[in-house]
Interface confidence: medium
Amino acid sequence: ECVTKVFKDISFQGGDLSTVFTPSATYCRLVCTHHPRCLLFTFMAESSSDDPTKWFACILKDSVTEILPMVNMTGAISGYSFKQCPQQLSTCSKDVYVNLDMKGMNYNSSVVKNARECQERCTDDAHCQFFTYATGYFPSVDHRKMCLLKYTRTGTPTTITKLNGVVSGFSLKSCGLSNLACIRDIFPNTVLADLNIDSVVAPDAFVCRRICTHHPTCLFFTFFSQAWPKESQRHLCLLKTSESGLPSTRITKSHALSGFSLQHCRHSVPVFCHPSFYNDTDFLGEELDIVDVKGQETCQKTCTNNARCQFFTYYPSHRLCNERNRRGRCYLKLSSNGSPTRILHGRGGISGYSLRLCKMDNVCTTKINPR
Amino acid sequence: ECVTKVFKDISFQGGDLSTVFTPSATYCRLVCTHHPRCLLFTFMAESSSDDPTKWFACILKDSVTEILPMVNMTGAISGYSFKQCPQQLSTCSKDVYVNLDMKGMNYNSSVVKNARECQERCTDDAHCQFFTYATGYFPSVDHRKMCLLKYTRTGTPTTITKLNGVVSGFSLKSCGLSNLACIRDIFPNTVLADLNIDSVVAPDAFVCRRICTHHPTCLFFTFFSQAWPKESQRHLCLLKTSESGLPSTRITKSHALSGFSLQHCRHSVPVFCHPSFYNDTDFLGEELDIVDVKGQETCQKTCTNNARCQFFTYYPSHRLCNERNRRGRCYLKLSSNGSPTRILHGRGGISGYSLRLCKMDNVCTTKINPR
C-alpha cells in the first residue's frame, strides 16, 4: 500500500537498518526509497533533541510485515518509502539548504560567485556528491564565497550542523545536468586495476553498469563473466574509483568487461532497473516467499508488487513432480545490497529483478534518443 | 559475546595454547585476536613474579565453552580476544616501549638520529618485525644511537627485559607505512625454490597469498593447484623466505602459482579474510558443529558468528519433490592453524571461511588506491 503522508512528532519503533544524515525529511524519504531494503524511515528534525549531533538523523528501517509500531516523539517525522507507490520518482534533488553545513570529505575548495555556481561545480566534478557554500554573510571574511566540494562513502553527509551564512546542496548529476563526459562504451576483454570500493554479483555487464551508476562513489567497473577462469569470481561486478576519476591501468584479460558509470549521462536507457530475464540462471539470496504462478512475467510482476522483493528465480512447471496446471514455482528473494548473493547456471531456473526501480529512471529515459 | 574489559590481578585457569612475549597487555590481546584459536589471554605484567624471565609473558588460551575459570594472581592481566567483537581491528601498533629490550635475532645494526628513524628503518626492511634503539642516555657510550633490527620465527620477541636507555617497538608495515616495493603479481606455472618456513592447505593462490601476508616471516609463496600431478601436494601453500627477501630461483612448472606477501602494500583488497565460496569443494578439519541452515550464506554467517569456527562445508539439500524447507547441512570446522587439513572435490559441498578476520583488514583496504 502506498502511503505518501508523513507523520509529525512520530517515530517508528525498531526495524533499524542504518542511520544517515539528511537535510530534510523529504530527502530522507528519497534515500529510503533508493536503499535496497528500506521501507520506512524516521527523520529527526532540527531541535528534535537536546543533543544537536542527533539532529538531521535519517533512520532507515525495514519490517517483514512492512509496518512498525508508532511512538510519540517530539521533532521526529516518520513516513514510508515510495517503493510501494506507483508514481514516477526522480533521484534529482535541486533544493538548497540555508544555514546548514553538510559535512563530508572536503576535497576541493574554490572561490565562486554564488551558491548556484558552486552547485554547478559540484555537478561537473566526477567525485562531488554535495557541497557547502559560504555566502557573503559568512562570519569569517576570509572564507566568504568559498565553495567546498564534498563526498562520503555513502553519498550522504557524515553529519549536518547549523551554521549561519552557508548554503548546502547536492550534485545535480541525477537531474541530467552534468557537463562531464558521458562514456557509454563497454570494453571487452578489459580489467581496470584501480581501487575496488565495493563488489556485487551481477548477471551481465549491463546490470553491473547500472549498479555502478546507482552507487554513490562508483566511477567505473570491471565485470567477470560466466566464462571467467576463476570460478569464485564469475559474475563479480567490481565497483571502482580513482583519484583522477579515470582508470589508471587497463589489463587485457579474456572474459572480463569494463566500463563507466552513466551518472554524467542524459539517460537514453534505464539505469536503475534491470528488466531482462536470465535463462537457465539461479539467483541465490534470502528467500522471501515461494509462490506458484504461470510464467516468468507473472513471477516478475509478483516480485515487483512485493515491496521487499529485489529479485527472483522462476522454475517452469516441467520441473515440478506431479505437475497439474502448468504453473511454475516463483522464489521471491532479497539481499542486503539488492543483488544476488550468487548466480548459478544449469539448474533450469529463469531469474530476474523487481521492476520497482524502473520508476526511478529519470524522465529523459523516454525522451532522449541514444547517441 | 564481546568483552572489552580487562581483569587486573586475575589469571584464566587452563586452556593454554602457547606463550609468547609482548610488551603490554594491549599487544597481548592483539596477538590473541590474530591467533587462529585464541579466545582468552593472561598477560604477566612487570613485577608479576619474583622471576623476571616470566615478566611480559602473554599466555594464549582457548576454551570449548569460550570461558575459563578466573583465579586471583597479583600482576596478571586477563581478557578476551576481539574475535567476538564487531569493531574494526587494526594490526597496526605504533606504540614504543621505553626501557624495554625486545629480544630477537639482531640481523642489522646502524646508527640513526632517533627512535622514529629506527622504526622507519624497520618498517622499510623486508625481514624486520621489531627493533630496539639505544638512546643518548644508554649507559654504554659506544652503543648510543644504535638501531637494532630484529625478527623471530613467531613475530614476537623471544623474551623482553628491562633495560635503561633503550626504546623498542614494532614495524609499521601493517599500518600501510612501508615504502618497500609492493608486488601484486601472481605468477602462473611458477615454483619458487627457496626456504619453506611453513605450509598450509588453501583452496586457491589468493587465499595462499593472504595467509602469507598474515604470517610473521613469509615473504613469498608457491601454491600447487588442484591439477598438480602429485596428489599429496595439491592445494598446498608453501610459505617461503630468503636472505635477500626475494626468491633466488624460479622454476617453470605447470599447475603451480607463486607470488609475494602483500605486507608492504597499502591494501586495496582484503589480506586477512577469505570471503569467497568454493563450489564442489569440501574443507576437512576438526568438526565443531553441524547445523541445518538455509543456504551457504547462512552457513558462512553461522560460522562467522561462532568465535571458534574457522571454516565450513555446506551440503545443499537436493531439489526433492516433497521438499519442505530447502535447508542444507552446515558443518562448522576448525584446525590448529586456521586452514583446512585437506581439500577434496567432487562431493558436492560448498566451502568457505569465517569472515571474522575481515575486520582485521587495515583501514586502507577501502581507502587507498593500489600502487
Epitope: D124, A126, N179, A181, I183, D185, F187, E243, P247, S248 | -
Partner: nanobody
C-alpha cells in the same frame, strides 16, 4: 616533460579539407582525454573535438559536427583532426591539448598540457 607538437595547418578555400596531427612525447594517449581547441583573434579559446583514448567516445562542438573527425593512433602516440567542408568561421589557431583526469570534454580549463598551435585559415 610533456610535449605536444601540432602540424598540418595552412590556408585553404572554403569547402576544402585539412588534416591536423599532434605528436605527443612524455605523455601516453593510451588512457586519457585529448582534444583539439581553437582560438580566433579576439575570441575565447573554445573546444572543437575531444576523444577519450581508451575507447571510442568522441565529443564535438555543435559547429563542427558532421564535418570534423577526431581520431588517434596509440601506437604512434598521435592525435588527428580530419577537417572537411571548411568554412571561413573555422579560421583560428588550432591547439592540441591533453588532460589529466575526468573532464568536461570541451572545456579548455580542464586540460593541462598544451601544444604551441597550428594556424588554419579558410578564405571564401
Amino acid at each position: 616533460q610533456v610535449q605536444l607538437q601540432e602540424s598540418g595547418g595552412g590556408s585553404v578555400q572554403a569547402g576544402g579539407s585539412l588534416r591536423l596531427s599532434c605528436a605527443a612525447s612524455g605523455y601516453t594517449f593510451s588512457n586519457n582525454f585529448v582534444g583539439w581547441f581553437r582560438q580566433a583573434p579576439g575570441k575565447k579559446r573554445e573546444g572543437v573535438a575531444t576523444i577519450y583514448t581508451l575507447g571510442s567516445s568522441t565529443y564535438y562542438a555543435d559547429s563542427v559536427k558532421g564535418r570534423f573527425t577526431i581520431s588517434q593512433d596509440n601506437a604512434k602516440n598521435t592525435l588527428y583532426l580530419e577537417m572537411n567542408s571548411l568554412k571561413p568561421e573555422d579560421t583560428a589557431m588550432y591547439y592540441c591539448a591533453a588532460a589529466r583526469g575526468w573532464v568536461s570534454p570541451l572545456d579548455p580549463a580542464r586540460f593541462v598540457y598544451w601544444g604551441q598551435g597550428t594556424q588554419v585559415t579558410v578564405s571564401s
